[in-house]
Interface confidence: low
């Protein structure tokens, strides 16, 4: 359709000049150039056009919106508001557009219509372990579609950082803090779905315990306090290692001291402390650290001791270490009393004593005992006799 | 007679990963807490992992923290060293040592690996 | 985490002379403390563990002692053999080396 000009499309410029008809009388002849300055062709005006998709989910259908300030007229195609509605996904339409700004040729406009709006979904793929300090967000295809998924972009802006990809990450975040993520699909670079998010971190890791002491001061007890981390925290794990030995034992919130009973004497325990807070995982702080050893105490007591004559006057005492030692050296000592009267008391590196002239048929009491350096042991005690001299 | 015999070093470009590993011979494997340790040439000695017997445990400084994983495999008496994103700063050579304590008393070493980051 | 201050950082010394390092921690270790020596080229050695306790087969001539956050690593008679640098080593919380000292003989 060529435009009809208007009024303005042209400027007068009018001259008159004056002149004598034969008759005599004076003929008034006006002489008016009109000038008209070009107009671009509406092809032109509008090779740049670009076009919205709003999608309508009970109908299944799109609108495209025409992004012209101006009331254009369409062609193939009905314009209403200069939008163009009924369009079914994945199909192209024509419309052409034309205005009486613009001559002919008119535009053209291929309307290649994106896939249905419901075939995307806005995932949230952050990883709970990460939730704290990161945030995932991806679209998703979610039923196929025939269109052509080389002409589909994606576009985030989350704060004044923007991203042209399916999935964003972002990453060293604040916990338990609001971010705002905008997202929009386009096809053919025409945007046709957008979805807004605001997601919060999650709490994030409790920081780490101060510990203030951490000691023994007796055999078989150790005692742990501390301070606790700044930041928010459901309870406290206390784990504490001996030797290969594993225990771990749950802690209330409130509580800055720890009493350990029932310790083995003279063993080094490695102590861990950590916060930890049930999230959408739960989150461990990081652990403290400290080390003590506990204090001696007497060890058990020797077992298995036997005692055999080797001859007439002589005999011969064994035993088995101590299960536990409970301290740092290692002493076996033999008493040999002969009714009240201490007649032999020996030390040995090891539990194996030779005693010799010892008087004829007389009853002896033999205590074996272990000394750990610190504290002897409970002695074991065992009676033999020895005989008539044979000779 | 106790071993330790690192290996794995190497030069490799910033960003990128490499294992380390430290056979052990002549003790307990499983009995013993294992600490990786390292040392810029004509530097000071750097803590760098540690972790115990049964691998329960593990610590690790800010400096390699979600960049380096400590592990062993008990079965075969080895402790590994994974080190990702390498960094010129990473650049020295790293030993392994036993706890003889635990957690602490490193009372054997290895000899070392060297590992060189530069692009 | 803890930090380890060694001081001097180098020391020099004759032999026979009775030597002693120091090591200071920003907090208290708890006498969780060892000492290590590392020669030239070599890989480090255990010298003492626990503040005071001197590993098997180290000489009597190094001691250890200290509590708190204030540890010393004693040479009663410095030997030519000792030249190396000496690195104090917490283990009380998380773990951390001292920067060392270089010892040498005048």
């Known amino acids: 359709q060529s435009p009809t000009p208007s009024p303005t499309d042209a400027y007068l410029n009018a001259s008159e000049t004056t002149t004598l008809s034969p008759s005599g009388s004076a003929v008034i002849s006006t002489t008016t150039i009109a000038t008209t300055p070009s107009k671009p062709t509406c092809d032109e005006k509008y090779a740049n056009i670009t076009v919205d998709y709003l999608y309508n989910k009970e109908t299944k259908l799109f609108t495209a919106k025409l992004n012209v300030n101006e009331n254009v007229e369409c062609g193939n195609n009905t314009c209403t508001n200069n939008e163009v509605h009924n369009l079914t996904e994945c199909k192209n339409a024509s419309v052409s557009i034309s205005h009486n700004s613009c001559t002919a040729p008119d535009k053209t406009l291929i309307l290649d219509v994106p896939p249905g709006v419901e075939k995307f979904q806005l995932h949230d793929c952050t990883q709970v372990e990460k939730a704290d300090t990161t945030i995932c967000l991806k679209w998703k295809n979610i039923e196929t579609f025939t269109c052509d998924t080389q002409n589909i972009t994606y576009r985030f802006q989350c704060g004044n950082m923007i991203f042209d990809n399916k999935e964003i990450k972002l990453e060293n975040l604040e916990p338990e803090h609001e971010y705002k993520c905008d997202s929009e699909i386009l096809y053919n670079n025409h945007k046709f779905t957008n979805a807004s998010k605001i997601i919060k971190t999650d709490f994030g890791s409790p920081g780490e315990p101060q510990i203030i002491f951490c000691r023994s001061e007796a055999a078989h007890q150790g005692v742990i306090t501390w301070n606790p981390p700044q930041r928010s925290f459901h309870n406290f794990t206390l784990c504490y290692i001996k030797e290969t030995e594993k225990d771990c034992l749950n802690l209330d919130k409130n509580l800055i001291k720890y009493d350990l009973q029932n310790l083995k004497p003279y063993t080094k325990y490695v102590l861990s402390l950590h916060a930890y807070i049930i999230a959408k995982v739960q989150r461990n702080g990081s652990a403290a650290m400290c080390h003590f050893t506990t204090k001696s105490a007497p060890p058990s007591q020797v077992w298995n001791m036997t005692v055999s004559m080797t001859s007439d006057n002589s005999m011969h005492v064994k035993c088995r270490p101590p299960r536990d030692r409970n301290g740092p050296h290692e002493r076996y000592h033999l008493e040999v009393e002969a009714g009240n009267t201490l007649v032999r008391n020996e030390s040995h590196k090891n539990c194996d004593f030779r005693v010799k002239d010892l008087q004829y048929s007389t009853d002896y009491t033999f205590k074996a005992y272990f000394h750990n350096g610190d504290y002897p042991g409970e002695p074991f005690i065992l009676h033999h006799s020895t005989s008539y001299n044979s000779k | 007679e106790v071993q330790l015999v690192e290996s794995g070093g190497d030069r490799v470009q910033p960003g990128r990963s490499l294992t380390l590993s430290c056979v052990t011979s002549?003790?307990?494997?499983?009995?013993?807490?294992m600490t990786w340790i390292r040392q810029v040439p004509g530097k000071g000695l750097e803590w760098v992992a540690s972790?115990?017997?049964?691998?329960?445990?593990?610590y690790y400084p800010d400096s390699v923290k979600g960049r380096f994983t400590i592990s062993r495999d008990n079965a075969k008496n080895t402790l590994y060293l994974q080190m990702n994103s390498l960094r010129s700063e990473d650049t020295a050579t790293y030993y392994c040592?036993?706890?003889?304590?635990?957690?602490?008393?490193?009372?054997?070493w290895g000899q070392g690996t060297s590992v060189t980051v530069s692009s | 985490d803890i930090q380890m201050t060694q001081s001097p950082p180098v020391l020099s010394a004759s032999v026979g002379d009775r030597v002693t390092l120091s090591c200071k921690a920003s907090?208290?270790?708890?006498?969780?403390l060892d000492w290590y020596q590392q020669k030239h080229g070599e890989a480090p050695k255990l010298l003492i563990y626990?503040?005071?306790n001197l590993q098997t087969g180290i000489p009597s001539r190094f001691s250890g002692s200290g509590s708190g956050t204030d540890y010393t690593l004693t040479i009663s008679s410095l030997q030519p053999e000792d030249v190396a640098t000496y690195y104090c080593?917490?283990?009380?919380?998380?773990?951390?080396f001292g920067s060392g000292t270089k010892l040498e003989i005048k």
């Open positions: 080593y917490q283990h009380n919380s998380r773990f951390t």
């Open positions: 907090q208290n270790i708890n006498k969780n």
């Open positions: 002549g003790f307990t494997f499983n009995n013993y807490w």
């Open positions: 972790i115990s017997s049964s691998g329960g445990s593990i």
């Open positions: 626990e503040t005071n």
């Open positions: 040592a036993r706890d003889e304590r635990w957690a602490g008393a490193m009372d054997a």
